[in-house]
Interface confidence: medium
Amino acid sequence: SIPWNLERITPPRYRADEYQPPDGGSLVEVYLLDTSIQSDHREIEGRVMVTDFENVPEEDGTRFHRQASKCDSHGTHLAGVVSGRDAGVAKGASMRSLRVLNCQGKGTVSGTLIGLEFIRKSQLVQPVGPLVVLLPLAGGYSRVLNAACQRLARAGVVLVTAAGNFRDDACLYSPASAPEVITVGATNAQDQPVTLGTLGTNFGRCVDLFAPGEDIIGASSDCSTCFVSQSGTSQAAAHVAGIAAMMLSAEPELTLAELRQRLIHFSAKDVINEAWFPEDQRVLTPNLVAALPPSTHGAGWQLFCRTVWSAHSGPTRMATAVARCAPDEELLSCSSFSRSGKRRGERMEAQGGKLVCRAHNAFGGEGVYAIARCCLLPQANCSVHTAPPAEASMGTRVHCHQQGHVLTGCSSHWEVEDLGTHKPPVLRPRGQPNQCVGHREASIHASCCHAPGLECKVKEHGIPAPQEQVTVACEEGWTLTGCSALPGTSHVLGAYAVDNTCVVRSRDVSTTGSTSEGAVTAVAICCRSRHLAQASQELQ
Amino acid sequence: QEDEDGDYEELVLALRSEEDGLAEAPEHGTTATFHRCAKDPWRLPGTYVVVLKEETHLSQSERTARRLQAQAARRGYLTKILHVFHGLLPGFLVKMSGDLLELALKLPHVDYIEEDSSVFAQ
C-alpha cells in the first residue's frame, strides 16, 4: 500500500509492497528554490543541506505573524516529495535549498535570478555530478528569468519547473515558458488535470509533460514526523525532478536533450482526459504522465523524437510561425496546422546555423502553427532538398539523391492563397518511397539525413470517405520522424505527430462533400537506427 | 533584503565624474527595450533588472551601473545598486525611479531592462 502518486510513476516491474526502485539518485544533487525548509524533518534529515542563500521580499500586511512551521510548509513538502525517506521519489538524492520565497510563498524575479546565479557560481567553484534545479514557482512571463534559465541549462544543469496553477496557457508564465526548462503540469489519481479551487494546472505547448500533483503526501513542517497532503504543479514538478535524479544517477552523462526525450518516451501516453483543457489548447498540450523508466539502462539504442509546437503566428496575411529544436536535437521534419485550414504550408530553413520549421499563414486565415519533429540522432548530417513548383500536371517531387541519405520528412509550401479546391489529389507513384510529392503549385522540401545505421520507411493510411482525422502509426521498434498529408486534399487543416502516430486533420466533414475531394491520406515516415541498437548491445 | 524606501545609506548622489560622459554611447541602430509583467498586480515598479549584452565583462557592468548612478544624480535622482550580476547574465539590479528608464535604456552595453515582478509558490 504505497501512495497513489508513487505507484503511478513506478513501472510494474518495480512494484512491490514498498516503493524501492534501484538506486535512488545518489549521484545527483537537486537544488530547490523555494521557501525555507524544516531540515530536521524525519523524511529529509541528513538529505537536505540548507544553503545560506536567502533573497525574499517582506511579507504583506502589517499584522503578519511569522510562524516557522508556516514559513517552511511548501519547501519542506517538496523536499520530501523529491527525496523523502518514506514518501520520496529519489530516496538517495541529496538536496540543497535556497530560500527565494517568503512565509507567504511569495518571491521576486530578481531574487530568483540571484538564486540561479548562486547555483552557477557554486557549480563553478565546486563541480560535482549532475545537477537538477527545481523551481516550484511561477510569475508572469519574464524575458530575463527565461534567459537566466537558458544560460544555466546550457551550462549542463537540468531545470524542472511548475507549469503554474492558473488554469491558463503556461507560455504566459515564467520560468514555465522557457524552452530549455522541463515544465510540468499536474494530474490526479484518475489521470485527470488537477483542479485547484476555481483554477487548476496550466496547459499548452510550453508544458513538456504532466505528473502527479493532487493529494500528494509528503513531509509536513508542523513536526518532524508529520505528513501533509498538498496539491499543485509544484508537487508535479518535484516528481519529475526526482525521476530526473534517478535517470541521471543511472546515466550521469545524459544531456538535457537526452533526459527530456527519455522523460517523454517513458511517460504514460494518452491517459489524460483532454476535455478539461480549452478546445484550442488540446492539440498543443502533451498527453503524457511522467514515469520512471522500466530499467535504468539500455534505452540508448532507441531513436528518440518529440514534437515541438510553435507559438501561434497570428492572423495577418504574411504571418509566420517558427518551431525550433533544442541545440542537441536534429529537426527531422516540419509540418503545419491551421484551425481554419487557410495556410500556405511550411518549410525547413536555416537560421543561425540550425534548421528551423516555419509555417505560413494565408489570406483570410486565423493563423498557423509550425510543428517540428525533433530527434536525437548522434553523428547525423541532415540537409533540406527543395523542388520549386512544377509545371507538369503530375505535381512537384523531390528525393534524397545523396548516397546514404534517407528521407526523414516532407514539407510543402505554396505562394498562392488557394491551391485550387477542385483539383484531384496527386498520388505518389508506388515504389518510390524516398521522395516527397506535392501539389504542382507548391515547392516541396525533403529532409534528408545521413547517420550511422539510420533506416527509414514510408507508411500511409488513406481513407476514401471524408474523415475529420486520419492517423497512421509506426510499428514497435520504429520511431515516427515525419508526418504529412498527401497533396490534393485541400480541406486538410494540417498534420502533426502525437507520440508515434501521424495525425492528419481535415475540416468538419459536414462541410465537405463525399467526392474524391474527401479522400485523406496520412503519410508517416518511420525510422530506426541499427547503429544505436548495436552500440547498446556492445555496452551490455 | 533592503528596507522600504527609507534605507538609502548606500544611495549615490555622485558629483559629475569622468564616467558621466557619452564615450561609450550605444552602437547606432541598436535600441535597448523595456519589459514589464503583463499581470499588473504582480509588478514591482521601482526595482529594475538591467541586462547587458552577452559578452559584457563584470568590470563593464560595474562601470555601467556607476554611470547610471552618476547620470541620475545629476538629474537629482537617488539610485541604489542592489546586485551586480555575473556568471549567468551580465547586468545589475537597481532601485530607482521609473522616470530614469529612458536614460538607462541609452546606457552603453544595455540589451534590455525588465521591471522586477513577483513569483509565487505553486
Epitope: I2, R42, A68, S73, C223, S224 | -
Partner: antibody, heavy 131, light 106 residues
Framework: QVQLVQSGAEVKKPGSSVKVSCKAS????????ISWVRQAPGQGLEWMGG????????NYAQKFQGRVTITADESTSTAYMELSSLRSEDTAVYYC????????????????????????WGQGTLVTVSS | DIQMTQSPSSLSASVGDRVTITCRAS??????LNWYQQKPGKAPKLLIY???TLQSGVPSRFSGSGSGTDFTLTISSLQPEDFAVYYC????????FGQGTKVEIK
C-alpha cells in the same frame, strides 16, 4: 466515530510470542493510522510503534526494534501487534490507538494532516508473561 | 529519543482549585505536544492537542499553553470527575510520554 475493539487477555510463557488484534467498527478504518502503546502495571504510557500513516510501513520505537511486528488487514479493518521473545517485564496492558486526521487549508492546496495524535483508543488487552 | 519530564509527579487538590501541570521536553518540539487524561482501568483520553487546542467535547476548564520545551496544562476549576492521571506526549520525534501526574483529592 471509529470504535476500536481489542482481543481478549492473554497469559504467555517467557520466550513465547503474543499477537493482539484491534478491530475498527463504525466509520472508515484507516489501517495506515494505528499505533500501539503499552502500560505496565502502575507505570506510565510507552509508545511501541505504529504503521506509518502514509505508506503503511511500520515504524518502531528503538526499544522494541526487532521484537515487535505491526501489521494491518484492510479487508477486515483489523490491526495487529505481535511481540516476540516475551519476558516478565512485558506484562502490561496493550492499547491500540488511532492517529488523528484534521482538515486544513494553506496556500489553498493542502488537504489533511496525519500525525501521532491519538484521538481514539481500544479498551486495552492485558498480556501477562509468567512461567 | 526526546525525553518528557512532568512535574509534579502527583498533587492533591480540592474541587474548585486551579491546577497546573508542567511538562518539559529534552529538546525543542515546536507545538507538537498532546495532553491525555487517564482514569483507573480505562484507556487514555485526548484533552489538548498541538500544545493548546482543545479536543472537541472536552470542557473549557482545561487549557494548554507553551511551545518549544516548556508546556503547561491548566484546569481552571477542578471538578470531581477530573481526579485522574494526566500525561503529556510529544510527537515531534517518535512519540514519547511524560511519566504522568496523578491528581488526587486533598
Amino acid at each position: 466515530q471509529v470504535q476500536l475493539v481489542q482481543s481478549g487477555a492473554e497469559v504467555k510463557k517467557p520466550g513465547s510470542s503474543v499477537k493482539v488484534s484491534c478491530k475498527a467498527s463504525g466509520g472508515t478504518f484507516n489501517s495506515h493510522a494505528i499505533s500501539w502503546v503499552r502500560q505496565a502495571p502502575g507505570q506510565g504510557l510507552e509508545w511501541m510503534g505504529g504503521i506509518n500513516p502514509i505508506l503503511g510501513i511500520a515504524n518502531y520505537a528503538q526499544k522494541f526494534q526487532g521484537r515487535v511486528t505491526i501489521t494491518a488487514d484492510e479487508s477486515t479493518s483489523t490491526a495487529y501487534m505481535e511481540l516476540s521473545s516475551l519476558r516478565s517485564e512485558d506484562t502490561a496492558v496493550y492499547y491500540c490507538a488511532r492517529h488523528y486526521e484534521i482538515q486544513i487549508g494553506r496556500y489553498g492546496m493542502n488537504v489533511y494532516y496525519l500525525m501521532y495524535r491519538f484521538a481514539s483508543w481500544g479498551q486495552g488487552t492485558l498480556v501477562t508473561v509468567s512461567s | 529519543d526526546i525525553q518528557m519530564t512532568q512535574s509534579p509527579s502527583s498533587l492533591s487538590a480540592s474541587v474548585g482549585d486551579r491546577v497546573t501541570i508542567t511538562c518539559r521536553a529534552s529538546q525543542g518540539i515546536r507545538s507538537a505536544l498532546n495532553w491525555y487524561q487517564q482514569k483507573p482501568g480505562k484507556a487514555p483520553k485526548l484533552l489538548i492537542y498541538d500544545g493548546s487546542t482543545l479536543q472537541s467535547g472536552v470542557p473549557s476548564r482545561f487549557s494548554g499553553s507553551g511551545s518549544g520545551t516548556d508546556f503547561t496544562l491548566t484546569i481552571s476549576s477542578l471538578q470531581p470527575e477530573d481526579f485522574a492521571v494526566y500525561y503529556c506526549q510529544q510527537f515531534d520525534g517518535d512519540p514519547t510520554f511524560g511519566q504522568g501526574t496523578k491528581v488526587e483529592i486533598k
